[in-house]
Each structure stands twice: as structure tokens, then as C-alpha cells.
């Protein structure tokens, strides 16, 4: 989801944004720094072994906003927050995973129907 | 339209500090970063650092770390670039530039002259 | 730190012909957002550096049309297709892509 009531449809930012990142570092980042022309963004999600991991980094403009939108992907507990309003300002983002589903328990996160 | 202006000449004694300004107008101050960079004859063109006005974040050159202070006043407008403990080697052109995603317009530069 | 190359350092031109002043930088240029941040500048004796070029092609305003940019990854250059008087100076390739953003040494054109 994005922060502060920013408008769906992306514009251009007039200047770089430096945004904090951590397992998601380009190699045109320099001391866990990256810059962007998007948004800075914080995830989490569960890896295979069911345990939470909090990525977070830089998102560029194209295609940030679908990125950032957060929709809710089949067997897979996940959740993203964006946010511009200020450099490193996903230090401040917390994103918490979903609820699970009775559905994920039986299903587990490799079975489909 | 953009102007970055900056003083005239400055002469200083070596051990000293300085503050150099740069004041923008023609332009939303906060909506770019303000570079400084360092100009020596025959040495080119040196990368200091940059701050952004909006929210006083820097950005510097491992190689100007402890000897150049970025900061901003946004009620007038003004970058600074504070200079310590100075040496012949800083003697050079400094100029602030404005910054988006690359510089498009700069300062007329200050000469910096240290000396005993 | 990214090394920016320029060659040649002096290039003596006679008016009305064409320039062509390269620059390569020991790193690729192209940023994470898949823009490339490399500019020119032309800096005029006793004046500070003016913007020709950035991101590899795209003119600055008021640059007239006889100054072009082109080249990706590592390897650029700058096309002056018919030099006049008042292009002469020192001309600088920059990268904004990496911190900390480097220029390369400067290119002197000059009247044969």
C-alpha cells in the first residue's frame, strides 16, 4: 500500500530519491543506500520454510505503482508498503503479513487444487 | 529564471575555517539537491557532496568526510558548504549546482585562496 | 570510484568541421532504474560549466542541434556537426549513476 495519500497513477519526481535497503541492494547502491526515481519500499514475506524475511529498497517509477498496490497473491502471505515522501523514509515502514486463512493450513504453501 | 549565485573571492589562513553560500532563486528550493563541487587548475572537476533541501539529507565524497559540512537554510534559500582546518590544497573554485538526477545549472563558483 | 576517460585531451578543429570527443567509464553507467546518467558539460574560460547533454542523448534547452550525444554501458560520445566560434572550451563528460559521482578529466577544443 502506499503512504500519506499519495494518488494511484505515478509522476515523475524532479530529483533522485535515496531510499535504505537490505537484501534488495543494487550494485549501484553504495552503504546499503539505492536511488530511485520511484519509490523506496519495505516488504515482508514468508520463505519457504514458513519464516518471515523484511526486504526493502528501491522501486523505480515504471511499474512502481503495480508494485506497490500490494495485491494479495494466492498461498503466498506477503505485504509491501512504498513511500516518497522523504530519503530513507522505508526505515519508518513496518508491514505486517497478512492474517493466515483456514485454507492456508490445510493447504500449506505447495499443494494447489 | 534559475540562478545560483555565489560571493566573490574568499582568502583565508591555513588551520581556518569557511563558509561558503550559494542562494537559489528561480526555483521551488526544496524540489532539488544542491551539489558542491571543487574545481583546482588542471586537476578537473571533484564530486563533494549534495544535501537535499527538503529534509537536510547528505550525501558526501568519502574523500571530503570531516572536511566538508553541508547545510541548508530554507527560508532564504541558501546552501553552505563549511570548509575546516584548511590547507594550500583547498585552495580552488567551488561551485554549488542544482541536482535532480543530473546538475543543469550552476553557481558562478567561489574562489577559495588559502594562505599565510 | 567510477574512472570517467576522455580522449582526446586537445582537439584542434578548424570551423565548420565536425567534432567528436569520446568518453568511457571503468564501470557500466546503466542505473538499477534502467536510466543512464551520463551528461556533458561545456565549461567557457573564467565561466562555471553549462549543460549540453544528459543522460547520454538528450539535448538541454537552448543547446542548439549541432551537439549530439549518443553510446551506452561504457562507451560515449559527443558530436559537434559543424563547430563554431563560440564552442570553443573544455568539454566534460559527468556520471550520476554511481556515488560518488565522477567528470572526466576534460576535453580542450581549440582553432586549429
Known amino acids: 500500500k502506499k503512504e500519506d495519500g499519495e494518488s494511484t497513477a505515478p509522476t515523475a519526481r524532479p530529483k533522485v530519491l535515496r531510499c535504505k535497503c537490505h537484501h534488495h541492494c543494487p550494485e549501484d547502491s553504495v552503504n546499503n543506500i539505492c536511488s530511485t526515481d520511484g519509490y523506496c519500499f519495505t516488504m515482508i514475506e514468508e520463505d519457504d520454510s514458513g519464516t518471515p524475511v523484511v526486504t526493502s529498497g528501491c522501486l523505480g517509477l515504471e511499474g512502481s505503482d503495480f508494485q506497490c498496490r500490494d495485491t494479495p497473491i494466492p498461498h503466498q502471505r506477503r505485504s509491501i508498503e512504498c513511500c516518497t515522501e522523504r530519503n530513507e523514509c522505508n526505515k519508518d515502514l513496518h508491514p505486517t503479513l497478512p492474517p493466515l486463512k483456514d485454507r492456508d493450513f490445510v493447504d500449506g504453501p505447495i499443494h494447489h487444487k | 529564471q534559475v540562478q545560483l549565485q555565489q560571493p566573490g573571492p574568499e582568502f583565508v589562513k591555513p588551520g581556518a575555517s569557511v563558509k561558503l553560500s550559494c542562494k537559489a532563486s528561480g526555483y521551488t528550493f526544496t524540489s532539488y539537491w544542491v551539489q558542491w563541487v571543487k574545481q583546482r587548475p588542471g586537476q578537473g572537476l571533484e564530486w563533494i557532496g549534495e544535501i537535499d533541501p527538503s529534509d537536510n539529507y547528505t550525501l558526501y565524497n568519502q574523500n571530503f568526510k570531516g572536511k566538508a559540512t553541508l547545510t541548508v537554510d530554507t527560508s532564504s534559500s541558501t546552501a553552505y558548504m563549511q570548509l575546516s582546518s584548511l590547507t594550500s590544497e583547498d585552495s580552488a573554485v567551488y561551485y554549488c549546482?542544482?541536482?535532480?538526477?543530473?546538475?543543469?545549472?550552476w553557481g558562478q563558483g567561489t574562489t577559495l585562496t588559502v594562505s599565510s | 570510484d567510477v574512472v570517467m576517460t576522455q580522449t582526446p585531451l586537445s582537439l584542434p578543429v578548424s570551423l565548420g568541421e565536425q567534432a567528436s570527443i569520446s568518453c568511457r567509464s571503468s564501470q557500466s553507467l546503466v542505473h538499477s532504474t534502467g536510466n543512464t546518467y551520463l551528461h556533458w558539460y561545456l565549461q567557457k574560460p573564467g565561466q562555471s560549466p553549462k549543460l549540453l547533454i544528459y543522460?547520454?542523448?538528450n539535448r538541454f534547452s537552448g543547446v542548439p542541434d549541432r551537439f549530439s550525444g549518443s553510446g551506452s554501458g561504457t562507451d560515449f560520445t559527443l558530436k559537434i556537426s559543424r563547430v563554431e566560434a563560440e564552442d570553443l572550451g573544455v568539454y566534460f563528460c559527468?556520471?550520476?549513476?554511481?556515488?560518488?559521482?565522477?567528470f572526466g578529466s576534460g576535453t580542450k577544443l581549440e582553432i586549429k
Open positions: 543522460k547520454v542523448s
Open positions: 549546482a542544482r541536482f535532480g538526477f543530473y546538475v543543469d545549472y
Open positions: 559527468s556520471q550520476s549513476t554511481h556515488v560518488p559521482f565522477t
